[in-house]
Every structure is written in C-alpha cells, then in structure tokens.
C-alpha cells in the first residue's frame, strides 16, 4: 500500500510570494496514482484544492482562481509538488495530500 | 443558460476613473471564481484581473495599484474599479467565469477608450 | 512571465482539410493550456482545457494535444464556420498570459 511523507513540518512565506509543499509518496509508483492535495484553514472545514490524475491529468477547485495553486509530480524523486502563487494572509493554513491508488 | 453581461465602459481621459460592472446570472455565482481579461486593438488577450469566491483577489504588475476587482455575491455582480488610467488600458473588457475547468463563459465585453 | 508563442499568425486551408494550430510554452506548465476560438465581431469561446480536454458542446474536430511546453490544437474535416482567430492561454501560474493568436483563413 502506498505511504504519504510531508517532510515540511512547516513553511513560512513573505507576502506575494511562492510557497512550495512536498508531498513524497512510497509504496507505490506515484505514476500508477492520482495526488489529491487540501487545506484547512483554522476553523473551517477541509478543503479540496487541487489533484493531479495517474495520467497527469490536473483538475481545481472552481471557487479558486486558475493560476493560484499548481501541481506537479515528478516520477524520478515520486514528489507531487504543490506550489502555491502570490502567497497572502488566507493562505495561512495546513496542507495535506492525500493518495488515491489507480 | 450560463450568461454574462458587461457594462459601464466609455471613453475616459487619462489619469480618469471608470468602474465595469458584469451580471452574472444562470450558474452559482458565489462558488465560482471570476476574471477580467481585455483584448487590446490589437488584438491581444490579456489577463487584468481575478478573485476567488471567497473574495481574494490577483493581478498582473500592469494593473496592480490602479485596477481593483470586487464581486456582490447577493447580487450576482462581478466589478472593475479602475482608475488612474493610461492609453494603454484601451481594450474591449470581458469578464469570464474562472476556477476549473478556466474561462469557460465569456461576456459580450465592453470597451474602454482612454483618450484626451 | 510565461510567454506563450504562436508563430503562426496567419494559417489558410480548404473545407474538409485538416489544420494544425502551434502554441508553445517559455517553460513547463505541464498541461494547464486551454484553447480559444474568436470568431469576427464575437467574444472568444473555449474550446479545449487541460491541453486536450473539449468543453461542452464543442465539435469532436476540435482535439488538443500536448504537455510540459508544446502544444497543438487540430482541427479536421474543417467547416467553414471555422472562420475565426485562435487563442492558446497557459493556466499553470499568475500571471496567465495567452498567445498572440493565429487567424485561420478559409480557401
């Protein structure tokens, strides 16, 4: 079964920058699986972001904007990247990925 | 039937202000990101603006400081406050329905004529 | 700044032919490209996203195709309503930005 290791306990960003969130997946090919990544800003519930399918297939969450978030999956470290443009206050918030095995 | 009307371009002199306005109606408007793009005389898209449903707002180095995007959830209207305006910032404006999947409805666009 | 190039400004082909539409990436933005169609006196319309998914409604002679910096879009069996300019739009970071269009011109 596949494991999910966010080796960034935390990150800490200037405004209007780029933030960038690791994902590292084990187990399993992170090729053969889809990466599901969320948020949940304190006190609200958790929040579908951003996914990036087996066949690198990427879908948003509608609400956000299509430049916010991007996500990408390199095969040679199985990292799924989340990066996160013009970093601001409603940014602040803690980052999970889940897997999805095909 | 998805629909966006724009509305409140003109011609303004530079240094003026102008504000757009875009009804939305026939989706959930308040769950949807929404932008700006123009298309110059030229014919060139170019991205001015977007904000979130929730209400953040993004922009390009060009309009930043000078454009100020906001939406009326209640009201289904998205707005384009801009001012300081240059020759340059002459362009057709649409306002289209962002998020995923992107820019999949446009408005009929309204132009902007900056000139003295 | 993500430049996205079309090179091709102007583009002529016949009824029933097959066209190739070029767009290419100054960097990776694996396939967050989407395609336009801007016919005379219209607002654009989408066509394609997720470099080769078709948005609802549109014409299966629409296909897109491409990842990481090149992108195409082909149209076959072109109709004559296919008249109009082309937009490709990279979607992967701020500031989106859109290529400079190619014009398909009808034999």
């Known amino acids: 079964a596949g494991h999910l290791e966010q080796p960034q306990i935390s990150s800490t960003k200037t405004l209007s920058k780029t933030a960038r969130l690791e994902c590292v997946v084990s187990g399993i090919t992170i090729s053969a699986t889809s990466v599901y990544w969320y948020r949940e800003r304190p006190g609200e519930v958790i929040q579908f972001l951003v996914s990036i399918s087996y066949d690198g297939t990427v879908r948003k969450e509608s609400g956000i904007p299509s430049g916010k978030f991007e996500v990408d999956r390199i095969p040679e470290t199985s990292t799924s990247t989340l990066t996160i443009h013009n970093v601001e206050k409603q940014d602040i918030a803690t980052y999970y990925c889940a897997l999805w095995e095909v | 039937e998805v629909k966006l009307v724009e509305s409140g371009g003109g011609l303004v002199k530079p240094g003026g202000s102008l504000k757009l306005s875009c009804a939305a109606s026939?989706?959930?408007?308040?769950?949807?990101?929404m932008s700006w793009v123009r298309q110059t005389p030229e014919k060139r898209l170019e991205w001015v603006a977007s904000i979130s449903s929730g209400g953040s707002t993004y922009y390009p180095d060009s309009v930043k400081g000078r454009f100020t995007i906001s939406r009326d959830n209640a009201r289904n209207i998205l707005y384009l406050q801009m001012s300081s305006l240059r020759s340059e910032d002459t362009a057709m404006y649409y306002c289209?329905?962002?998020?995923?999947?992107?820019?999949?409805?446009w408005g009929q666009g309204t132009t902007l004529t900056v000139s003295s | 700044d993500i430049v996205m190039t079309q090179s091709q400004k102007f583009m002529s082909t016949s009824v029933g032919d097959r066209v190739s539409v070029t767009c290419k990436a100054s960097?990776?933005?694996?396939?967050?490209v989407a395609w336009y169609q801007q016919k005379p006196g219209q607002s654009p319309k989408a066509l394609i996203y997720?470099?080769?998914y078709r948005y609802s409604g549109v014409p299966d002679r629409f296909t897109g195709s491409g990842s990481g910096t090149d992108f195409t879009l082909t149209i076959s069996n072109v109709q004559s309503e296919d008249l109009a300019e082309y937009f490709c739009?990279?979607?992967?970071?701020?500031?989106?930005?859109f290529g400079s269009g190619t014009k398909l011109e009808i034999k």
């Open positions: 997720s470099a080769s």
């Open positions: 960097q990776n933005v694996g396939t967050n």
């Open positions: 739009q990279q979607y992967n970071s701020f500031p989106l930005t």
């Open positions: 026939g989706f959930t408007f308040s769950s949807y990101a």
């Open positions: 289209a329905r962002d998020g995923y999947p992107p820019f999949d409805y």
